[in-house]
Interface confidence: medium
């Protein structure tokens, strides 16, 4: 079920909190853990039985501006002989993340948080077989 | 910062880059998408590198619940349903952005935080190191 938009803000702010207009929040986009690095196994996108390619999407009105999306290279999976086995399926694995969207309305600018679905890689699965009666 | 294309008719005082602090609408676009991977697909069970999903809960974060994948096996499941140790199940990790309240007790003040999550697992050919 989807909850409709609600239009009240009602929290009492402690004295030390920054003043915030109703219906909005203050967001510091200086990222905590900015320098953390992914320590994934080397070249897994090429070594996987469900290999994938990466595409960088770039949007100057989004923060972060670069979002990397994976695309599975094959419909099937790569077998021990290095051939595509179409009895198995390469499928995308997805994860949500937050981005900040910058919107221009005339000369005014507003900011909105947005959930974005990122494809992070692929995995090899046994297909679901639907038997026709 | 990020350069923003600007309407040429607007005053030049507008900052071209994303400012360090922004005022953001409380309504999150696309926020009602399904965030429970157990509901959205059964890939975690059908994969040749299956994984379990662990609930990571932090009430002081948005979203408060994030699902972490842990590979079930070191090897991969072969056509016979057995674990094949000539192949490796490895986690696919992704950096995501979440919100953290900052200062801690201020209701409408937040900061972006980058966290590393394991989203699922994939089956890879191992890197073999030959000892001379």
């Amino acid at each position: 079920r989807k909850i409709p938009k609600v239009g009240h803000t009602f929290f009492q702010k402690p004295e030390s909190c920054p003043p915030v207009p109703g219906g909005s929040m203050k967001l510091d986009i200086g990222i905590i853990n900015e320098n953390q690095r992914v320590s994934m196994s080397r070249n897994i996108e090429s070594r996987s039985t469900s290999p994938w390619n990466y595409t960088v999407t770039w949007d100057p009105n989004r923060y972060p501006s670069e979002v990397v999306q994976a695309q599975c290279r094959n419909l099937g999976c790569i077998n021990a002989q290095g051939k595509e086995d179409i009895s198995m399926n390469s499928v995308p694995i997805q994860q949500e993340t937050l981005v900040v969207r910058r919107k221009h309305q005339g000369c005014s600018v507003s900011f909105q948080l947005e959930k974005v679905l990122v494809t992070v890689g692929c995995t090899c699965v046994t297909p679901v077989i639907h038997h026709v009666q | 910062g990020i350069t923003i294309p600007r309407n040429p008719g607007c005053p030049n005082s507008e900052d071209k880059n994303f400012p360090r602090t922004v005022m953001v609408n409380l309504n999150i676009h696309n926020r009602n998408t399904n965030t429970n991977p157990k509901r959205s697909s059964d890939y975690y069970n059908r994969s040749t590198s299956p994984w379990n999903l662990h609930r990571n809960e932090d009430p002081e974060r948005y979203p408060s619940v994030i699902w972490e994948a842990k590979c079930r096996h070191l090897g991969c499941i072969n056509a016979d349903g057995n674990v094949d140790y000539h192949m490796n199940s490895v986690p696919i990790q992704q950096e995501i952005l979440v919100l953290r309240r900052e200062p801690p007790h201020c209701p409408n003040s937040f900061r972006l935080e980058k966290i590393l999550v394991s989203v699922g697992c994939t089956c890879v050919t191992p890197i073999v190191h030959h000892v001379a």
């Epitope: 909850i3 009240h8 | 409380l26 999150i28 809960e57 974060r61």
Partner: nanobody
Amino acid sequence: EVQLVESGGGLVQPGGSLRLSCAASGFTFSSYSMYWVRQAPGKGLEWVANIKQDGSEKYYVDSVKGRFTISRDNAKNSLFLQMNSLRAEDTAVYYCAKGEILPLHFDYWGQGTLVTVSS
């Protein structure tokens, strides 16, 4: 699995009282703000009240202040709404919702309980 189950709704005359309950399970109840929200027939969702994790702070929409009281029992994973001096305009389906740290963001809510105020 997170579950929120409301009860206590019903038909009541104007000026009467009802006590709504919400039984919570599947999450650390004491760690989250909890909300009551309502939806009148043909209307959008309206926030009614919310209560902080430890019950120390409570907030109400102006139209129910002085008439409704929100409370919680963390030992029993339960949320309550005591509704007094009920009016016809309080007629709605009342939902209990689990709050995120963002104000007015609910990630789970119950199936609702109908409150009808009519003579």
